[in-house]
């Protein structure tokens, strides 16, 4: 997990200022109002590995 301004979060995650860490975009299904979910809308999801 990276601090903002150094490197982006890994694919499928987005930076949360509230929690001070990268958070899973998948959690936006249950918690759409989380601060980091705005960043998820612009980023592609992590690919499935079937």
């Amino acid at each position: 997990e990276q601090a903002p301004g150094t490197a982006p979060c890994s694919r499928g995650s987005s930076w949360s200022a509230d929690l001070d860490k990268c958070m899973d975009c998948a959690s936006c299904r249950a918690r759409a109002h989380s601060d980091f979910c705005l960043g998820c809308a612009a980023a592609p999801p992590a690919p499935f590995r079937l």
Partner: antibody, heavy 119, light 111 residues
Framework: EVKLQQSGGGLVQPGGSMKLSCVAS????????MNWVRQSPEQGLEWIAE??????????HYAESVKGRFTISRDDSKNSVYLQMNNLRPEDTGIYYC??????????WGQGTTLTVSS | DTVLTQSPASLVVSLGQRATISCRAS??????????IHWYQQKPGQPPKFLIK???NRDSGVPARFSGSGSGTDFTLNIHPVEEDDTAIYYC?????????FGAGTKLELQ
């Protein structure tokens, strides 16, 4: 370091009551949904209760098996979550864990506390 | 409620070999983007330890020997190569809806 420190538990007679407590440290408690999960040889791992956030007036959810008998509550000022258990039954016997989740997975668990309901 | 069925109930594997654990959901627990299945490891006298989230994403600090896959209703946890320390019970859990339920567990033992 994330820590969930549990207290309470012990032996109680059928029909009796017990309150479990869990104090959290090392993470932003008020942002996390707090849960109780119990484990027994008969039922395996069984989620029993969850309390969500102040911003939504602390909504709660319960397993059908404990609805109306158990009450989950939290005190964000004390980083604590509680489980008040009333009208206890022998089938409530097990190890009780508090666990936190942001939305989906239980990433941190307490050490567990044993409840025995027996006469 | 979504029921998770794990198989096998127990598994004996030789050191260095592959352990494969299956978790089948009674309904789909995937969207087009994510699968809402998570894996845990539990050793005697300890609480479950979170291993893998969203079917395939390892938690930080979890060795690359652990991998998860699957979507829809069928999911797999693979451990390869198996090490001594991997002796434990492994559980899957879904977060598709309330209640979140767990599989009955798979006990992994070393030969």
């Amino acid at each position: 370091e994330v820590k969930l420190q549990q207290s309470g538990g012990g032996l109680v007679q059928p029909g009796g009551s017990m309150k479990l407590s869990c104090v959290a440290s090392g993470f932003t408690f008020s942002y996390y949904w707090m849960n109780w999960v119990r484990q027994s040889p008969e039922q395996g791992l069984e989620w029993i209760a969850e309390i969500r956030l102040q911003s939504n007036d602390y909504p709660t959810h319960y397993a059908e098996s404990v609805k109306g008998r158990f009450t989950i509550s939290r005190d964000d000022s004390k980083n604590s979550v509680y489980l008040q258990m009333n009208n206890l039954r022998p089938e409530d016997t097990g190890i009780y864990y508090c666990a936190c989740r942001y939305a989906d997975y239980f990433d941190h668990w307490g050490q567990g506390t044993t409840l025995t309901v027996s006469s | 409620d979504t029921v998770l069925t794990q198989s096998p109930a127990s598994l004996v594997v030789s050191l260095g070999q592959r352990a494969t654990i299956s978790c089948r959901a009674s309904q789909s627990v995937s969207t087009s983007d994510y699968s809402y299945i998570h894996w845990y490891q539990q050793k005697p006298g300890q609480p479950p330890k979170f291993l893998i989230k969203y079917a395939s994403n390892r938690d930080s600090g979890v060795p690359a020997r652990f991998s998860g896959s699957g979507s829809g209703t069928d999911f797999t946890l693979n451990i390869h190569p198996v090490e001594e320390d991997d002796t434990a019970i492994y559980y899957c859990q879904h977060s598709w809806e309330i209640p979140p339920t767990f599989g009955a567990g798979t006990k992994l033992e070393l030969q």
